[in-house]
Interface confidence: low
């Protein structure tokens, strides 16, 4: 059962796992949610009746029954983790805490103009978990405007105390606001020989990398595969760090793989969601339950629905045994990973999908697409929307992309002549325009946010956000696309598609069925040669075939240029402008979304 509200003046008795310090009960709830075992918590607020050493303590708790006895206690605030809930969860915490000093290892001290600048510095520093900033009014002259960057083993403060004229806050890495590089490569036959901060068991290097990404201290990792010569180290995932933030030594070793934390691109890749099945593999751990199940998929469902289950092993039924049902072993451990991994025993293992909601919804795998042909199939581009205007007659106006449950990203030029959001309708989950009838449900538009530097498409800043009046419930046919990571600026995308209902040639008409075309990206230098009369800026991205023939056209505007990278689709461009349609040596010009990620986040995350 999902309980979101906090219980004031209430303490949960017993069930303690560990105590951390958090600046608020709200953040204590987030820490509990992300902890592998925590189901409930009790937070102690500052209060004259309470011992100051207990202020800001956040006691994480577990219970076999998923609840604990309640006791009345002033200044205690208790609640439940969001693990029991189905809604999206985010670790992003933009709050600034006034007159609180969050203690940790002060590893960097510098002058900053403001708390915001200090927070940005923390966000862009690989080691920083949180910061404390001494304001202009701080009593000690030499400490004024000092920004202290801090880290701890847990990522949360070791203590929190009251201190006048300082403010504290957390790194915004988990808000997708870091400019740190996102190195997705996994290096085969490589060992990083730096200090280990922790080790866990993992079935493959990808899971190891995801564990590293959400471990507060891990910057890179080494994974020993099941073919690793030393048996005791097989499937071992070593979580590592270094002072410089990079591995100091790389050793060539067969059957080992190494890689980096994906912290700075975690909003566009799955980090918590280990959805694969591992055949002929047994996960060992504390047994929670043994249930009969028809298949390993059914076993994963059972694990996902049991809030305390972290991973499972399924042993298929022996012929004609138990109505063809196998045994599903639901398991858990102190850190969410198997205590040991065994091979060759015939089991099929995997992880709970409960934690998938901690990842951005946009990273969910969508159904395989039909390759070839120009007409799309239902569910192939679930982020694509058709934006209609109702004045003077209802018609398709532009394309757009779902990027959040209340947000559509599109082109600014679509709103030329549109004087009010009231005349706009957003239809999602649409394949054919003919599906849209008078009674077809749509999303009204509450607000049109056009980039304030936009003048005309050709001069850039051709980007706009639509805030919807109601939220989109994500389904297979309507779900968001990931924004590219700022750390991904140097990625070379090779699998890019433009989609829309636009014309197939000039002076055509809007197409009934959503069209798709695979189009290669063109360098900005090459694009500039093709448009000598225009300035192709770094905020634009171009795509097209030299010989022409495939391109966006009228009516595709505002729609996505979607590129697949590491199995996740990213919104790389917004259809903006071009000379004619599909003309030889005239590529389409798109708004380069990665250059607007800060603008998008600023507008969509504004309180």
């Amino acid at each position: 059962e999902c309980v979101t509200q906090l219980l004031k003046d209430t303490c949960f008795e017993g069930g303690d796992i560990t105590t951390v310090f958090t600046p608020s009960a709200k953040y204590c709830q987030v820490v509990c949610t992300y902890h592998p075992r925590c189901l409930l918590f009790t937070f102690t607020a500052e209060s004259p009746s309470e011992d100051p050493t207990r202020w800001f303590t956040c006691v994480l708790k577990d219970s076999v029954t998923e609840t604990l006895p309640r006791v009345n206690r002033t200044a205690a605030i208790s609640g439940y983790s969001f693990k029991q809930c189905s809604h999206q969860i985010s670790a992003c915490n933009k709050d600034i805490y006034v007159d609180l000093d969050m203690k940790g290892i002060n590893y960097n001290s510098s002058v900053a103009k403001s708390a915001q600048e200090c927070q940005e510095r923390c966000t862009d520093d690989v080691h920083c978990h949180f910061f404390t900033y001494a304001t202009r009014q701080f009593p000690s002259l030499e400490h004024r405007n000092i920004c202290l960057l801090k880290h701890t083993q847990t990522g949360t403060p070791t203590r929190i105390t009251k201190l006048d004229k300082v403010v504290s806050g957390f790194s915004l890495k988990s808000c997708a606001l870091s400019n740190l590089a996102c190195i997705r490569d996994i290096f085969p036959n490589t060992v990083f020989a730096d200090s280990n901060i922790d080790s866990v068991m993992a079935p493959d290097a990808f899971v190891c990398g995801r564990i590293c990404t959400h471990h507060p201290g891990c910057l890179f990792f080494t994974f020993f595969s099941q073919e690793w010569p030393k048996e005791s180290q097989r499937n071992l995932c070593l979580l590592k760090t270094s002072e410089s933030g990079l591995p100091s030594t790389r050793i060539k070793k067969s059957k080992a793989l190494s890689g980096f934390s994906l912290q700075s691109c975690r909003h566009s890749i799955p980090v918590f969601c280990h959805s694969s099945f591992y055949h002929d593999t047994d996960f060992l751990g504390e047994e929670l339950d043994i249930v009969a199940a028809k298949s390993h998929e059914a076993c994963q469902k059972l694990c996902t629905n049991a809030v305390r289950c972290q991973f499972f092993t399924y042993t298929p039924a022996q012929a004609s045994c138990n109505e063809g049902k196998g045994k599903c072993y639901l398991k858990l451990s102190s850190n969410g990973s198997p205590t040991k991994i065994l091979h060759g025993r015939g089991g099929i293992s995997g992880y709970t999908l409960r934690l998938c909601k901690m990842d951005n919804e946009c990273t969910t795998k969508i159904k395989p697409r039909i390759v070839g042909g120009t007409a799309s199939v239902r569910g192939e581009w679930p982020w694509q929307v058709t934006l209609h205007t109702t004045s003077p007659t209802q018609r398709h106006l532009c394309g757009g992309s779902i990027i959040g449950n209340q947000w559509i990203l599109t082109a600014a030029h679509c709103f030329y002549g549109v004087e009010s959001p009231k005349i706009l309708r957003v239809y999602s989950g649409i394949l054919n325009q003919s599906e849209i009838k008078e009674d077809t449900s749509f999303f009204g538009v509450q607000e049109i946010i056009i980039h304030d530097q936009y003048k005309m498409a050709e001069s850039g800043y051709d980007i706009a956000l639509l805030k919807l009046e109601t939220t989109v419930n994500y389904t297979d046919s309507q779900r968001p696309i990931c924004l590219p990571s700022k750390g991904d600026r140097n990625v070379i995308y090779t699998d890019c598609w433009v989609t829309g209902w636009g014309y197939r040639k000039l002076r055509d008409k809007i197409q009934n069925t959503l069209q798709k075309a695979k189009i290669p990206l063109v360098t900005n230098e090459e694009c500039q040669k093709r448009y000598r009369g225009h300035k192709i800026t770094h905020k634009m991205i171009c795509a097209g075939y030299r010989e022409g023939g495939k391109d966006a056209c009228k009516g595709d505007s505002g729609g996505p240029l979607s590129c697949k990278h590491n199995e996740v689709w990213h919104l790389v461009g917004i259809t903006s402008w071009g000379e004619g349609c599909a003309q030889r040596e005239r590529p389409g010009v798109y708004t380069n979304v990665v250059e607007y990620v800060d603008w998008i986040l600023e507008k969509t995350q504004a309180v």
């Epitope: 002549g417 498409a457 000039l506 009228k554």
Partner: nanobody, 121 residues
């Protein structure tokens, strides 16, 4: 206040002719490419014809090529569509609109309120 006012529609027999006009005000007409767009009953919009700001480069949908002629008089701030050899399938509401170039939405910027053309025997 931008205004586009279509006129010249009406009932005509198959094979007959009509001349539509669109009077523009509230903006610099000579700076804009212009289009005629139509919507047949129960159908989507169809771009019929377009012309650039100076009166060159007329474009036509395949369905009207050789029968319709687009023109403009920038001195009078007026756009025209001469429709000859009309067919029943030309029955639609005809709109004039400022045309924002090749891939700029179906939005066409500013629109008139439309004039009804009915081709019937």
């Amino acid at each position: 206040q931008v205004q586009l006012q279509e006129s010249g529609g009406g009932l005509v027999q198959p094979g007959g002719s009509l001349r539509l006009s669109c009077a523009a005000s509230g903006f610099t007409f000579s700076n804009y490419d212009m289009s005629w767009v139509r919507q047949a009953p129960g159908k989507g919009l169809e771009g019929v014809s377009g012309i650039n700001s100076g009166g060159g480069h007329p474009h036509y949908a395949d369905s009207v090529k050789g029968r319709f002629t687009i023109s403009r008089d920038n001195a009078k701030n007026t756009l025209y569509l001469q429709m000859n050899s009309l067919k029943t399938e030309d029955t639609a509401v005809y709109f004039c609109a400022t045309d924002e170039g090749e891939r700029y939405g179906e939005d066409f910027g500013y629109w008139g309120q439309g004039t009804q053309v009915t081709v019937s025997s």
